[in-house]
């Protein structure tokens, strides 16, 4: 069971001094989002017992394994259900505390009732302030039963629950009609999933026989020990004022555990600490009684005295729960209460005994949970004890459970049960994860989900080149850190597998599934340099470069050209995918921009050194498009174009350029310059008769501007085939070259 205790301080003279503390003895509990899992949660649960809203309660974390709830301002804040949740994953456990108002009309004789499946549970509500009206019983907040006030027996209202089953578990309450719910008696019923003394699926396994009021857990067969007791069977008392599964916690304050209620994981529930009883755990046990809630009776024999915390204290020469065993009777010594082994191992188990007559090898035996008896293979005889050594056959999962060492002599017999946990070595369920790669190294995250049992003590990473028959290389790594595999071959696939181990002999698990991780290519080392560049338009740039001559094949897949526009903080990248290329045309650039240009060789995803940078200034963009372009056929070989000058010119136009193309034709268009920029019309001559042409034009200042709209026009009639179109501006006689 999870080592989780919810402590309620019941010194109720002042609610502001009331506090609840949840203490976890689990390793690393409560540290929150780190590797150890979720934190401790402590809260009031208003789902069943609803109380009027008050100021929020204060939660304080004290170290990694303790959380305290304070800030109760009035007694009604205390009434209800509180829960603490701790442990990680499948071990996540909720501990519940139910608080009753000391001034309620009805009070529970006993708050927590733990019963076995099939038992009859009897809840008893004692009349504290009588009302002559019905009593309503509820289960988990819903109506359950009614009693007339005349049905009280000896000042108590009883609710009998025959043949209880696990779903009957929960919070029960008894309330007088017309009274505030805060005046109810609240109970907690815990129904174990099995009949008395049984546990496990199908309830086929036998409980270890929990002592001192411990309760056998119906899922794992472990004893949940009352506060103040420890051991597999709760056979050992803690020192006064201590609690926790290993007696590792100390009750706060000078009066020890007085006034504290302890709540433990189900099926234990809540009780006073060892040596105390009463509704507020403030009364010491009566003579002859001891333990949690003083429920145990000493019945000491042979001069033993009763200690209210630990039970019988035996005089010299006697031992046993009631001092009923003579020291001459053999006695098992210092047997560990719990042992852990890994699956399929063949451990040695030692069992030591003393007594008179002295135990010999044959008088000590070991019994497995299935009843198999093992005899010792050797014994070490010392003056004060005999230690028998047992060689255990290969362990299987069914060997988990309670083993028993038994010694028998003519003086009597003794036995000691201990728990053996057979753990399954961890096996990775997934392959390790590649984080980054270089040409000669891989960075790998080795920690993956796994089947079997933790904790993980070591992680081994096995790797070798893919399809290789050579031995695996192995590296042992810390479970929580990434690992770098070094001195690898470039551009090589490696098969990588994880192997996990848990503590103890035979803790190494099987190897996990392989994954293929490939190292990067070798880095390209050659540095190109820029031979030159020239502007082919306001947004076009042709670049050429060279590489140094070196022997051997070129290590590279292509080139990356980078243009940096410092003004806008933008980078343009152009990929040239041939390693033989030494020139590239860059288009779509921003006119009038100052660029920094460089070139790098690349190989796979790796970049070589960049060339020394060049600085390039593109000319600004040209003027806007001419407006209202119009075409008019004059003859079978002439078409006149008219237009209007562009608007918002940034400077004087140096010329116009006319583009002529036969409609639907496949050839390249012809460009004709109009060098008289003041003109707004021109005649295109030398055209073919009866042919449809497309025209558009643009102006130039320092650079060419935007194209105008395209216009269509057909030449007239049928004439001779012309040599090709030429142009004539108005008031200009000479033709222009195409």
């Amino acid at each position: 069971a999870v080592d989780l205790t919810l402590l309620a301080n019941l010194r109720l003279t002042d609610p502001q001094r009331f506090f609840l503390t949840c203490v976890s003895g689990e390793a690393g509990a409560g540290r929150g989002s780190d590797a150890w899992g979720p934190p401790l949660l402590l809260e009031k649960d208003d789902r069943i017992v609803r109380t009027p809203p008050g100021p929020p309660l204060r939660l304080a974390r004290n170290g990694s394994h303790q959380v305290t709830l304070r800030g109760f301002s009035k007694p009604s804040d205390l009434v209800g259900v509180f829960s603490c949740v701790g442990g990680a994953g499948a071990r996540r456990t909720r501990v519940i505390y139910v608080h009753n108002s000391p001034g309620a009309h009805l009070l529970p004789d006993k708050v927590t009732h733990t019963v076995n499946k099939g038992d009859t549970a009897v809840l008893s509500a004692r009349v504290h302030k009588e009302k002559q009206t019905d009593v309503i019983w509820k289960s988990n907040g819903s109506y359950f039963y009614t009693l007339d006030w005349h049905e009280a027996q000896d000042g108590r209202f009883l609710l009998q629950l025959p043949n209880v089953q696990p779903p009957s578990s929960g919070i029960y309450s008894a309330t007088y009609l017309e009274a505030s719910p805060l005046g109810s008696a609240f109970f907690r019923l815990i129904v174990r999933g099995c009949g008395a003394g049984r546990w496990g699926p199908g309830c086929t396994k036998e409980c270890p026989g929990c002592l001192h009021g411990g309760v056998c857990h119906d899922h794992d067969g472990e004893c949940v020990c009352p506060p103040g007791f420890t051991g597999t069977r709760c056979e050992q008392a803690c020192r006064e004022g201590r609690f926790g599964q290993s007696c590792q916690e100390q009750c706060p304050g000078i009066s020890g555990c007085r006034g504290l209620t302890f709540c433990l994981p189900d099926p234990y529930g809540c009780s006073c600490g060892s040596g105390w009883r009463g509704s507020q755990c403030q009364e010491a046990c009566a003579p002859g009684h001891f333990g949690a809630d003083c429920r145990l009776q000493c019945q000491c024999q042979n001069g033993g005295t009763c200690d209210r915390f630990s039970g019988c204290v035996c005089p010299s020469g006697w031992h046993g729960v009631h001092c009923e065993k003579s020291d001459r009777i053999p006695q098992i010594l210092n047997m560990a209460s719990e042992l852990e082994f890994n699956l399929e191992t063949m451990p040695r188990i030692n069992c030591a005994a003393a007594g008179n007559p002295f135990p010999v090898r044959g008088s000590i035996e070991l019994r497995k949970p299935d009843g198999t008896v093992l005899l010792s293979t050797k014994a070490i005889v010392e003056p004060e004890k005999t230690t028998a050594e047992f060689e255990v056959p290969r362990l299987v999962l069914a060997d988990s459970g309670f083993w028993e060492c038994r010694v028998s002599t003519s003086g009597g017999q003794d036995s000691r049960r201990f728990k053996v946990n057979v753990k399954v070595p961890p096996v990775p369920l997934a392959a390790p994860r590649l984080l980054t790669k270089q040409s000669r190294q891989l960075v790998v995250s080795p920690l993956v989900s796994f089947s079997g049992d933790g904790p993980i003590s070591t992680v081994r990473l096995h790797y070798r080149p893919q399809d290789s028959t050579m031995d695996w290389s192995t590296i042992v790594v810390d479970p929580s850190e990434n690992v770098t595999l070094m001195n690898l071959r470039p551009k090589t696939g490696y098969s990588v597998r994880v192997q996990l181990s848990r503590p103890g002999e035979g803790g190494e698990g099987a190897w996990g599934p392989p994954t293929l991780m490939t190292t990067d290519c070798p880095e390209p080392l050659l540095q190109p340099w820029l031979e030159g560049w020239h502007v082919e338009g306001t947004d076009r740039l042709r670049v050429s470069w060279s590489l140094p001559l070196v022997p051997g094949p070129l290590v590279g897949d292509g080139f990356l050209l980078r243009l940096w526009d410092g003004t806008r903080g933008q980078e343009r990248r152009e990929n040239v995918s041939s390693p033989q290329a030494r020139t590239a045309l860059l288009t779509g650039l921003t006119p009038g921009t100052h660029y920094q240009l460089d070139v790098q060789l690349y190989h796979c995803t790796l970049l070589g050194p960049a060339s020394p940078p060049a600085h390039v200034l593109l000319p600004p963009s040209g003027p806007p498009a001419p407006r209202h372009l119009h075409a008019q056929a004059l003859s079978d070989s002439e078409i006149q174009l008219t237009w209007k000058h562009p608007e918002a010119l940034p400077g004087p136009i140096s010329k116009y350029v006319v583009e002529v193309q036969v409609a639907g034709g496949a050839g390249d268009p012809l460009w004709i310059d109009v060098d008289r920029p003041e003109e707004t019309s021109t005649i295109i001559r030398g055209l073919n008769a009866s042919t449809r042409y497309l025209f558009r034009m643009r102006a130039s200042i320092q650079g060419l501007g935007d194209w105008s709209n395209t216009v269509e026009e057909s030449t007239l009639g049928n004439g001779l085939q012309a040599e090709g179109p030429v142009q004539e501006s108005r008031a200009a006689e000479e033709g222009l070259d195409q």
Partner: antibody, heavy 127, light 102 residues
């Protein structure tokens, strides 16, 4: 679905006896308090008797005390009303009803109410 | 015994109007013990309100209850045709029920 079905009504002479039954289904009969309520022709409702779940406690209206007996058989999910020494003023439709208890608010006291009723059975006392 | 008196004996209203029904106890009644029922001709009564002001399951929110001590009120905010019926108030005390005359 909760259902209450009364039976056993009929015509009886003054001074005679009659036993009414109420068969319950659709709920756990054995945990609920049950009541009989009657309604004389053209008149209002009058509570007659109640019985607690265990059957050990019963309550009666003054007008029927000593003449009527309420009982229940939890194994048969049935409520009974044994009516003796019947009078003309006992003529009425007799309803059986389930008593439920509600949380009137999250934090307030519990409130009772007759949440399910049968369709009633007519008892006529006449010579 | 506590007597419950309802008024008015008859309330003549039209659909869409607001209805206010009054119930007075001969001595103080705990609010949690006051309930209202509706009965239509030829049918069994139906629980409307418990604890003086809480609507029973399935009761439309046009029905509301209020009051404390000796004076209690059932209000139907906007009458629907199916709301025309006889209404009874009821108190529970000393393990006995008392109804108003309707």
């Amino acid at each position: 679905e909760v259902q209450l079905l009364e039976s056993g009504g009929g015509l009886v002479q003054p001074g005679g006896s009659l036993r009414l039954s109420c068969a319950a289904s659709g709920f756990t009969f054995s945990i609920y308090k049950m009541s009989w309520v009657r309604q004389a022709p053209g008149k209002g409702l009058e509570w007659v008797s109640s019985i607690y779940p265990s059957g050990g406690q019963t309550k009666y209206a003054d007008s029927v005390k000593g003449r009527f007996t309420i009982s229940r058989d939890n194994s048969k999910n049935t409520l009974y009303l044994q009516m003796n020494s019947l009078r003309a003023e006992d003529t009425a439709v007799y309803y059986c009803a389930r008593v439920n208890y509600y949380d009137s608010s999250g934090y307030g006291p519990i409130a009772p109410g007759l949440d399910y009723w049968g369709q009633g059975t007519l008892v006529t006392v006449s010579s | 015994d506590i007597q419950m008196t309802q008024s008015p004996g008859t309330l003549s209203l039209s659909p869409g109007e607001r209805a206010t029904l009054s119930c007075r106890a001969s001595q103080s009644v705990s609010s949690s013990y006051l309930a209202w029922y509706q009965q239509k001709p030829g049918q069994a009564p139906r629980l409307l309100i418990y604890g003086a002001s809480s609507r029973a399951t399935g009761i439309p929110d046009r029905f509301s209850g209020s009051g404390s001590g000796t004076d209690f009120t059932l209000t139907i905010s906007r009458l629907e045709p199916e709301d025309f019926a006889v209404y009874y108030c009821q108190q529970y005390g000393s393990s006995r029920w008392t109804f108003g005359q309707g």
